[in-house]
Interface confidence: low
């Protein structure tokens, strides 16, 4: 698409130093669509407009990246800049593109666990085996027992996913590793979807 990336860059380059700093701070707290990860604070605060544009596009893709940039600019009271992005969005058909592809599948730069949350809740049946693999290293005793206490596989997976927002990447990797061992064909299927 290209044009969206250029529009984001134009908008960010129009910000003063203080405004760019404020944009980054707001980006750290803005509500994200489900399935999308947050750009790490340490990296984010060091970026100039070009690096930030690249990061926005790599994390959120062009359509959602454009939308997110507009949201933050509006929140900062920079309506004019946001309107310019709105025009680009409408001209490029980004609205249709964003609406036609679910957030889960577009989050290609997100972790497998975040990308495929709904499918994993629906399709993982051997939850207890997954829990045993995560017990101690990822899940605390209380979390482990809380998931075990649920009755159906889907409820167990929902409960498990309620802990994911506080996980770091190692934890998510551990879950993926457990899934690969217990449900290899499901993981293969989702990786190719």
């Amino acid at each position: 698409m290209g044009r969206a990336r250029d529009a984001i860059l134009d908008a960010l380059e129009n910000l003063s130093g203080d405004e760019l700093k404020k944009f980054k701070m707001k980006l750290l707290t803005v509500q994200l669509r489900e399935g999308y990860g947050r750009i790490p604070r340490g990296a984010l605060l060091q970026m100039d407009a070009i690096d930030l544009t690249d990061k926005l596009v790599s994390y959120y893709l062009e359509s959602y990246g454009l939308e997110l940039t507009m949201t933050v600019l509006r929140d900062m009271g920079l309506q004019e800049l946001a309107e310019q992005l709105q025009t680009t969005k409408e001209e490029s058909g980004a609205v249709a593109a964003a609406a036609s592809v679910p957030a889960q599948s577009t989050a290609r730069t997100g972790h497998f666990v975040d990308q495929h949350r709904q499918a994993l809740i629906a399709r993982v049946t051997e939850v207890d085996g997954v829990l045993d693999a995560l017990h101690g290293s990822v899940l605390t005793e209380g979390q482990y027992q809380a998931v075990r206490a649920e009755t159906t596989s889907q409820d167990k997976m929902r409960k498990l996913f309620s802990f994911v927002p506080s996980w770091n990447l190692t934890c998510k990797d551990s879950l993926l590793q457990a899934l690969k061992e217990i449900h290899p064909y499901l993981v293969m299927d989702l990786e190719q979807s």
Epitope: G136, Q143, L169, D173
Partner: antibody, heavy 117, light 111 residues
């Protein structure tokens, strides 16, 4: 950022035990793993283990199992590490650290434990 | 356990020049595109301070003269240009599996 406060020094006799404390400021204590790290004088760093204040879930480095016991007091926002059957090898600075996301990004100033008769 | 070997054990670098520290792991500490190596500096009498996490991400507030790179088993910390205040011991640490381990440290002296 959460601040971690540790007592400066402890002098203990061989064979005795010592309980090192780590008090966290702020109300986010229950959300993060607390890690413990050992550093002998002039030496490198060794990871002892970790504890989650929400339910006292722990993981230990096998090397320190039986030597270190990690506990927390949620009401005071304090993590503890008890070291037992102390020998000269246990003389070191012991740090507590907090893992907020990827790495240990908040550290206490360390407690120096000296084992001497 | 994963063993991290740092080299050199010590180095002396002139003010304004580049310091390069290597960290080699006994097995891969990378997984699904993430590199679980972190870098810390430590000055005498102080706790370690996080500089870089996940091999290349700069911790908030750390000057941009610090940078990290690498994947798999080989990682590098670069400091350029080196400043007086960078004199310290630098450690790499992995968080790929338990137990987490640290490299033996590299002492940087400024000439």
């Amino acid at each position: 950022r959460v601040q971690l406060q540790q007592a400066g020094a402890e002098l203990v006799k061989p064979g005795a035990s010592v309980k090192v404390s780590c008090k966290a400021s702020g109300n986010t204590f229950n959300n993060y793993w607390i890690y413990w790290v050992k550093q002998r004088p002039g030496q490198g760093l060794e990871w002892i283990g970790r504890i989650h204040p929400s339910d006292s879930g722990t993981n230990y480095n096998q090397k320190f199992e039986g030597k270190a016991t990690l506990t927390v007091d949620k009401s005071s926002g304090t993590a503890y590490m008890q070291l037992s059957s102390l020998t000269a090898e246990d003389s070191a600075v012991y740090y507590c650290a907090l893992l907020s996301l990827y790495a240990m990004d908040s550290w206490g100033h360390g407690t120096s434990v000296t084992v001497s008769s | 356990d994963i063993v991290l070997t740092q080299s050199p054990a010590s180095l002396a670098v002139s003010l304004g020049q580049r310091a390069t520290i290597s960290c080699r792991a006994s097995k891969s500490v990378s997984s699904f595109g993430y590199n679980y190596i972190h870098w810390y500096l430590q000055k005498p009498g102080q706790p370690p301070k996080l500089l870089i996490y996940l091999a290349s991400d700069l911790e908030s507030g750390v000057p941009a003269r610090f940078s990290g790179s690498g994947s798999g088993t080989g990682f590098t910390l670069n400091i350029h240009p080196v400043e007086e205040e960078d004199a310290a011991t630098y450690y790499c640490q992995h968080s790929r599996e338990f137990p987490w381990t640290f490299g033996g440290g590299t002492k940087l002296e400024i000439k």
